[in-house]
């Protein structure tokens, strides 16, 4: 019988008492085969973290700073359940740390040196740790003691709880630096008052502070937020302009064998029975013998943290950067105006080898990082392990939802002004063998399908989106008799046709021979009835253009396109017979890397782009013998996006809507994780 006990860790006598009450009340409402609570008492949160890691306890609720400690080796804990605040309809699991300034003050984030600063309190998250952590490498050396470095960075501050004797500048704006509400500039409202009164130039608070202190929109409009990209935004645009997004209070567990489903089952049932306004005799979110015992008193309930979410992703790149800077105190030696090497994310061995070749030829400008799937690469870019990669539109959507931005677009048509003119896109098509003359768009049910990969534009999002509109359900594996759609569940009929061996079968990378445009077309040639690819795929792999044994004798005339009106047309008539227009593949990165990725890639394409005439004697960035490694092989150049510099603007309203509609069919664990952070 599986052990269904969750050992909760308590850090005080009062918490232990509440835990026992929790245990007893749960026993009274949950059947004997359901989850149960046991209580383990430790002296501190850090002891609880160690106990969970050592399998002496299973769960504890932590503030963001401790979630970071819990994630670090050797603890390796992960977030599993989040407390939420506000309403069930609009649950808030995060707050945003922001930098508020007066509208007419005219400076940016990178011009804070010499300004006067207002902080909620020394060592507090939004008011100190996050802003000072992010500014850490701009502080004058020596950076220890930190208070002295901060005092020398700003021209005056109010940092309640600081030592006014040792660091008088930190108390210049609030004599005495009192550590309670007796100090008019203490806490969130106090720090904002410090700005409002004109004592300081910037206040480091949380996003809700300004709304709580200024009910009137006209008053709020006198203030702005400083963004990390050295722009400003109105105060209500905090989701797009903050220093960090911080989880409020989170249950953590072991990453491996951590009972996360059991913990959720327990807490979900607990909130049903003992949540807000549920029971008089025991209340989960109330602490008669103290404050915030086990859970925050202000919490309204729990939400399950998506399983794909590790602590780094949950805490977010900015928060992790800030805390790591403060803890480790290390800064790059390079001057900050110089670009560091761009870490390119490569999928599987084939891409890594080409990336390494690029890295050697780039003379230190490009480094390579490997991942097994596109989603793993996106996650690595999010958390700073990698910086950039080129993505199909379907993944540009996911990357965008995860906070990444497009920076350059692949262009596929030769033109005089290639780099300045991003194209409208390419065509997604459905290809069949000419010999299967009875096959049309209207009778695909029961046929064998070939897809570039799940989540990609031409191979999945467009055809499956159109199909969904027809069949109104997501069981595409039942619609087709079998197929190869790399990235599907391994036991799905949509992995049946795939050719990868062993663990590589149906993997969404080049280890699966039927992956990508060329792979999907090969799948059609060898096994399938229909392939969903781009309009250039057939000509690029026929007429001897692909020397591989399976392709070298193929003829374009032996294939036709399926049109949405039920007719068929020759391959070259794609402009009048396609499923939809698809946005070109684009390079994505984090916002903080945007300028450097843009600069370095433009240099790299001038060295190794399509101006290189002899690819047998020189490295060519956009060539890989029809395997589309790192970039599509038909890329002519990487083009500037001009104002299409967000994923929504780049992909266009129509495509974003189409992918949004298909979201209910999404199997993307990363998309689920990212929409948890930003619904």
């Amino acid at each position: 019988v599986p052990d269904k006990t969750v050992r909760w860790c308590a850090v005080s006598e009062h918490e232990a008492t509440k835990c026992q009450s929790f245990r007893d009340h749960m026993k009274s409402v949950i059947p004997s085969d359901g989850p149960s609570v046991a209580c383990v008492k430790k002296a501190s949160y850090l002891d609880c973290i160690r106990a969970i890691a050592a399998n002496e306890a299973d769960a504890v609720t932590l503030d963001a700073g401790l979630v970071y400690d819990a994630y670090l080796a050797p603890n390796n804990l992960k977030p599993v359940v989040a407390e939420f605040y506000g309403s069930k309809e609009d649950p808030q699991t995060f707050y945003y740390a922001v930098a508020v300034v007066k509208k007419d003050s005219g400076f940016q984030m990178n011009q804070l040196r010499g300004k006067k600063s207002c902080h909620t309190g020394l060592g507090r998250s939004a008011g100190w740790n996050i802003p000072i952590g992010l500014l850490y490498c701009d502080l004058p050396e020596p950076r220890k003691p930190l208070e002295k470095a901060v005092a020398n960075f700003f021209s005056g501050s109010c940092a309640p709880c600081a030592d006014g004797t040792d660091f008088p500048q930190l108390c210049q704006l609030c004599p005495g630096c009192g550590c309670s509400t007796l100090n008019q500039y203490f806490g969130y409202s106090g720090a904002f008052k410090c700005l409002k009164d004109g004592a300081g130039d910037v206040a480091f608070v949380k996003h809700s502070t300004i709304f709580e202190n200024l009910a009137n929109k006209a008053d709020r409009d006198q203030y702005e937020l400083l963004c990390l990209d050295n722009t400003r935004k109105p105060v209500d645009e905090y989701k797009d302009c903050h220093l960090a997004q911080v989880p409020s209070h989170t249950v953590v567990a072991r990453s491996m064998g951590g009972k996360e489903d059991l913990i959720w089952e327990l807490l979900n049932q607990a909130q049903e029975h003992f949540g807000k306004d549920k029971s008089k005799e025991f209340q989960l979110f109330s602490s008669p013998h103290g404050k915030d015992l086990l859970f925050k008193d202000s919490a309204h309930g729990f939400l399950k943290v998506p399983p794909r979410m590790d602590a780094k992703m949950y805490l977010g790149y900015e928060y992790v950067t800030a805390i790591r800077n403060l803890r480790e105190g290390t800064c790059p030696e390079a001057p900050t105006d110089e670009c560091k090497p761009v870490k390119w994310c490569a999928l599987s061995h084939h891409e890594r080898l080409k990336c390494d070749e690029w890295s050697v030829n780039s003379v230190g400008k490009i480094e390579c990082v490997s991942a097994e799937t596109t989603e793993d690469c996106i996650a690595k870019i999010m958390n700073g392990e990698a910086d950039a990669m080129s993505l199909d539109g379907g993944f540009v959507y996911i990357a965008g939802k995860c906070g990444l931005v497009p920076v350059l677009a692949e262009n596929y048509n030769k033109s005089d002004n290639c780099e300045d003119t991003p194209e409208a896109g390419y065509f997604a098509i459905a290809v069949v063998k000419k010999s299967a003359s009875d096959l049309t768009w209207d009778n695909l049910k029961g046929k064998k399908s070939c897809h570039t990969a799940v989540g990609r534009t031409a191979g999945w999002n467009i055809p499956m989106g159109l199909l969904y509109n027809k069949i109104n359900h997501c069981r595409f594996d039942e619609f087709f008799s079998e197929g190869c759609a790399p990235g599907s569940k391994k036991d799905s009929s949509l992995c049946k046709l795939c050719m990868g061996s062993g663990l590589n079968l149906c993997e969404p990378n080049n280890k699966e021979g039927y992956y990508g445009y060329t792979g999907a077309f090969r799948c059609l040639v060898e096994k399938g009835d229909v392939a969903f690819v781009k309009h250039q795929t057939v000509p690029q792999n026929t007429g001897g253009k692909n020397p591989d044994p399976w392709a070298k004798n193929l003829n374009e005339k032996d294939y036709e396109l399926l049109c949405l009106d039920g007719t068929r047309k020759p391959v070259e008539e794609y402009a009048n017979c396609h499923l939809a227009r698809a946005p070109n593949h684009a390079v994505v990165t984090r916002k903080d890397k945007e300028a450097c990725v843009h600069k370095i890639l433009r240099q790299q394409q001038h060295l190794f782009g399509s101006n290189v005439t002899d690819c047998s004697g020189n490295f060519c960035l956009f060539r890989s013998e029809t395997k589309d490694l790192l970039f599509r092989d038909d890329t002519v150049c990487l083009a500037k996006l001009h104002d299409r510099n967000t994923y929504e603007k780049y992909l266009g309203e129509e495509y974003v809507k189409a992918v949004g509609n298909l979201r209910k069919c999404s199997t993307s664990s990363l998309l689920e994780a990212c929409t948890f952070r930003r619904p």
Partner: nanobody, 112 residues
Framework: QVKLEESGGGLVQAGGSLRLSCVAS????????VIWYRQAPGKQRELVAL???????NYRESVRGRFTISRDDAKNTVWLQMNALEPEDTGVYYC??????FGQGTQVTVSS
Amino acid sequence: QVKLEESGGGLVQAGGSLRLSCVASGSGFGINGVIWYRQAPGKQRELVALIKSDGYTNYRESVRGRFTISRDDAKNTVWLQMNALEPEDTGVYYCKTPGVPFGQGTQVTVSS
């Protein structure tokens, strides 16, 4: 101006071994890494193995486990140890470092 010279090729039976060397004249050799390529008759030149300045190595899949690339910066030399050779390994082998033109290469022939 750095020049590269490859040697160590020859005729060998399938299953045999060869050790190729790439020697550079001039300074600054291999600061950014060295790549071994090969070209079989009528085929495109393909990357075989590479070694970066920090000692990181990578190989094309078909040679992984059979070939080993190594370097000795003091001797301005990069080696390619080739074991369990197969007929498909036949071709002219070249070493390359950024900014330096290809040398003459060294012919490797593997007979079955």
